[in-house]
């Protein structure tokens, strides 16, 4: 007995053939001998059959000594044993349906959990094997689970059913909606413009939720929620913002978010937090802003950084063109009597200048001038 | 001299239901399959499913699956279509038509009903 | 479901010309087709079937060839009746498809 596998709403054409290239007398049964279509001359018949608005053949095959049997639209239930009689003779074929789905919707928040499910036909012992698109192989049986999805597991996953060593392959298109990074910086001198910036990893028809940027200023003791937004069909509407500092945002994606000054009461850590309409669970990106401040009192000329530097990083005062006078992994550097000159304050990391500031001193008789 | 007369005209509100009528005479009505065939206003033609007088066995176009109805009553030499759930785009000229077995292996259409108005709005 | 795609969908002609519609199918349909008629107002007639086969009492002046995907209707002579929509129809599948339509129009 020849086995087909179908898959669930596909089209599936049982083959049978007689041995006369011609258009000769034939008829499809099922394992009850139900008769689900055949011929009469050239007219197509059907039968009693479930399957009457599903089933088709092609007469164009039938002088070819070719009488198909298509069935459209496949169902589990179709999973069964046809039964072709063609000149006197009898071919049998299996048809077993399978169907593979996401558990629940095929658009998953970061970190949360994928589960496929196989629909099988009752008796069949199929087994499972899925490929991610990052490459990663899962195998199961009638369920397969992946815990913590990650930003690379969207895309097409490619699932592989196998059932009497006969294979059928199954596409699904995971999205995993999440931001762009996880994490990101800003560095930036006392006074500059701050740009926030929240791409997505993810495109959406229709998107739709609301949002918060929660803040934890350094000098701080607690977090505050700077600004509340609502995302109405990629629309940004804002809906509650604090009055400092005042934010502002962009009313169209990627969310973007403006603080007008860079100052030290602002450097710190943020939390934007986006919900999904439908989706339970939240999107969530940390931005972080440093701010750096150089300035001459009296005799002294100190350059510092607010807000969360890694201890790796080094700060550093140096009069233009000159050797480094002063170098520490501190986010504080000064220098006594400085002399005259465009002095440079550097934050960096292995050699990379990520913020610089620069100050002009003049000779002691008159005040610094800051470019 | 083989004739299809279809029932007239028909206004009905989205989400009702219309069945029509198609009276065969003038040959053997279990002999022929009837068709019904759509065609929306000023758009092309689309066939809906065929029924086969003689047995009753009917097929419908996967578009109107579970909404088309067709049946036949052979006292009468009639067969009916009814098109449950309309909305407005199911207004059209409905016609019926019968499949021809001289030639076309009972599926091209050698008579044809005048046609039935179906118009549903609200 | 198989398609059929009809070029051009509308065509000016004046009385005498000769004219071609095509008829393409989505997959080889050997010689199950059929060609149409239709009037404003009015249910199409049957011109030709087997996709050369001119119906009766349909003047010799249509006919049609092709086999497998490509087929055409050809009218000789054109006609001050003959202005008109013309549709093809696939019958190899028992899930019947026609063409999108040629209006055949007066120049």
């Known amino acids: 007995k020849k086995v087909v596998l179908g898959k669930k709403g596909d089209t599936v054409e049982l083959t049978c053939t007689a041995s006369q290239k011609k258009s000769i007398q034939f008829h499809w049964k099922n394992s009850n001998q139900i008769k689900i279509l055949g011929n009469q001359g050239s007219f197509l018949t059907k039968g009693p059959s479930k399957l009457n608005d599903r089933a088709d053949s092609r007469r164009s095959l039938w002088d070819q000594g070719n009488f198909p049997l298509i069935i459209k639209n496949l169902k589990i239930e179709d999973s069964d044993t046809y039964i072709c009689e063609v000149e006197d003779q009898k071919e049998e074929v299996q048809l077993l349906v399978f169907g593979l789905t996401a558990n629940s919707d095929t658009h998953l928040l970061q970190g949360q959990s994928l589960t496929l499910t196989l629909e099988s036909p009752p008796g069949s012992s199929p087994s499972v094997q899925c490929r991610s698109p990052r490459g990663k192989n899962i195998q199961g049986g009638k369920t397969l689970s992946v815990s913590q999805l990650e930003l690379q597991d969207s895309g097409t996953w490619t699932c592989t059913v196998l059932q009497n060593q006969k294979k059928v392959e199954f596409k699904i298109d995971i999205v995993v909606l999440a931001f762009q990074k996880a994490s990101s910086i800003v560095y930036k001198k006392e006074g500059e413009q701050v740009e926030f910036s929240f791409p997505l990893a993810f495109t959406v028809e229709k998107l739709t939720g609301s949002g918060e940027l929660w803040w934890q200023a350094e000098r701080a003791s607690s977090s505050k929620s700077w600004i509340t937004f609502d995302l109405k069909n990629k629309e940004v509407s804002v809906k509650r913002v604090t009055q400092d500092p005042k934010l502002q945002m962009g009313k169209k994606l990627p969310l973007h978010l403006t603080l007008p000054q860079a100052l030290p009461q602002y450097a710190g850590s943020g939390n934007l937090t986006l919900a999904l309409e439908a989706k339970t669970g939240k999107l969530h990106q940390e931005v972080n802003l440093v701010v750096m401040r150089a300035t001459q009192l009296q005799k002294n000329l100190t350059c510092e950084v607010w807000g969360p530097t890694s201890p790796k990083l080094m700060l550093s005062l140096k009069l233009e063109n000159k050797e480094a006078k002063v170098s520490k992994r501190e986010k504080a550097v000064w220098v006594l009597n400085p002399e005259a000159g465009m002095w440079q304050c550097l934050l960096s990391d292995s050699g990379q200048v990520l913020l610089e500031s620069n100050i002009k001193v003049l000779p002691t008789w008159s005040t610094p001038v800051q470019p | 001299q083989v004739q299809l007369v279809q029932s007239g005209a028909e206004v009905k509100k989205p989400g009702a239901s219309v069945k029509v009528s198609c009276k065969a005479s003038g040959g053997t009505f279990s002999s022929y399959a009837i068709s019904w065939v759509r065609q929306a206003p000023g758009q092309g033609l689309e066939w809906m499913g065929i029924?086969?007088?003689?047995?009753?066995?009917?097929s419908y176009a996967q578009k109107f699956q579970g909404r088309v109805t067709m049946t036949r009553d052979t006292s009468t030499s009639t067969v009916y279509m009814e098109l449950s759930s309309l909305r407005s785009e199911d207004t059209a000229v409905y016609y019926c038509a019968r499949a021809t077995g001289l030639y076309c292996s009972g599926s091209c259409f050698d008579y044809w009903g005048q046609g039935t108005l179906v118009t549903v709005s609200s | 479901d198989i398609q059929m795609t009809q070029s051009p969908s509308s065509l000016s002609a004046s009385v005498g010309d000769r004219v071609t519609i095509t008829c393409r199918a989505s997959?080889?349909?050997?010689?199950?087709l059929a060609w149409y008629q239709q009037k404003p107002g009015k249910a199409p007639k049957l011109l030709i079937y087997a996709a050369s086969i001119l119906h009766s009492g349909v003047p010799s002046r249509f006919s049609g060839s092709g086999s497998g995907t490509d087929f055409t209707l050809t009218i000789s002579s054109l006609q001050p009746e003959d202005f008109a929509t013309y549709y093809c129809q696939q019958y190899d599948s028992s899930f019947i498809t026609f063409g999108q339509g040629t209006r055949l129009e007066i120049k």
């Open positions: 029924i086969n007088p003689s047995g009753g066995s009917t």
């Open positions: 997959q080889d349909i050997s010689n199950y």
